[in-house]
Amino acid sequence: NWVNVISDLKKIEDLIQSMHIDATLYTESDVHPSCKVTAMKCFLLELQVISLESGDASIHDTVENLIILANNSLSSNGNVTESGCKECEELEEKNIKEFLQSFVHIVQMFINTS
């Protein structure tokens, strides 16, 4: 359920508020609907960087849970093959705040277009 993914993103944003994490993360800020699964997989990969950089058990657990929820939601869509989409490394690097903002935006796209 994508709304539960949103809930975990809110928890992560709450948890990192008091931390200073300098990491920049590959961020898709203008997702084409035909590339949304590819973009989501990039977001999930980059989310693990936040988990590692924070060194925080609560963040680690929330990230782990979010990834499971998101992968479950993606698999319920069936095996979607997307072509012509950007590789993660081709995306713009942004700070954590902007990354999370764009992450919420793409999850909302999955909700809105379901």
């Epitope: 203008d30 609907p33 903002q101 919420v104 935006h105 277009t113």
Partner: antibody, heavy 119, light 108 residues
Framework: QVQLQESGPGLVKPSGTLSLTCAVS?????????WSWVRQPPGKGLEWIGE???????NYNPSLKSRVTISVDKSKNQFSLKLISVTAADTAVYYC????????????WGQGTLVTVSS | SSELTQDPAASVALGQTVRITCQGD??????ASWYQQKPGQAPILVIY???NRPSGIPDRFSGSSSGNTASLTITGAQAEDEADYYC???????????FGGGTKLTVL
């Protein structure tokens, strides 16, 4: 600076169709944002009508869904609202607004246009 | 019935602090945003996300959330802060946007 401007008839007859257009300037309707219509009956609160993404995806308020259509015209950088079978209860100030990226918000609003439903 | 509930009215003495609240189960999943609306004018976004202010919004406005409640705090209220305040978020499905009923703030 993004600006939004609503236009359309200020008076619609009962059982008729309300049609409004929102012209977007200072930004592209083909940005990553969703675009919404919101209304406010005289002396009452705000009510969300629906939203559109430039690829044509739409979502509507369940209470209005059977009567509402929102469309987008990328060539004119505008989006439109159509509400059918109107009654006096649809009399309101109608606003168009741009949704922010990420968490729910409306970061830019039109100035609003009053539509009265009356014979 | 709205998924977001606000008290219809609040008041604050000039220069004092006031907190306006918004309640709803959906706020466990989503942050709320807050709008100020003065008579005859369009709403203006004052707070969005965890506690973000758009440029031009004074720093006396702040936002917070806990559980199913979001709050807008005005620290050192000014006469020009007298207005209606609305919260906004998504509903429990995540698909639809919803507004609270609004709080009319009077500055005494």
């Amino acid at each position: 600076q993004v600006q939004l401007q609503e236009s359309g008839p200020g008076l619609v007859k009962p059982s008729g169709t309300l049609s409004l257009t929102c012209a977007v300037s200072g930004g592209s309707i083909s940005s990553s944002n969703w675009w919404s219509w919101v209304r406010q009956p005289p002396g009452k609160g705000l009510e969300w009508i629906g939203e559109i993404y430039h690829y044509g995806y739409t979502n509507y308020n369940p209470s209005l869904k059977s009567r509402v259509t929102i469309s987008v015209d990328k060539s004119k950088n505008q989006f439109s609202l159509k509400l059918i079978s109107v009654t006096a209860a649809d009399t309101a100030v109608y606003y168009c607004a741009r949704e922010g990226i990420g968490w729910p918000s409306f970061d830019y609003w039109g100035q609003g246009t009053l539509v009265t439903v009356s014979s | 019935s709205s998924e977001l509930t606000q008290d219809p009215a609040a008041s604050v003495a000039l220069g004092q602090t006031v907190r306006i609240t918004c309640q709803g189960d959906t706020l466990r999943n989503y942050y709320a945003s807050w709008y100020q609306q003065k008579p005859g004018q369009a709403p203006i976004l004052v707070i969005y996300g965890k506690n973000n202010r758009p440029s031009g919004i004074p720093d006396r406005f702040s936002g917070s959330s806990s559980g199913n409640t979001a709050s807008l705090t005005i620290t050192g209220a000014q006469a020009e802060d007298e207005a209606d305040y609305y919260c906004n978020s998504r509903d429990s499905s995540g698909k639809n946007l919803v507004f609270g009923g609004g709080t009319k703030l009077t500055v005494l």
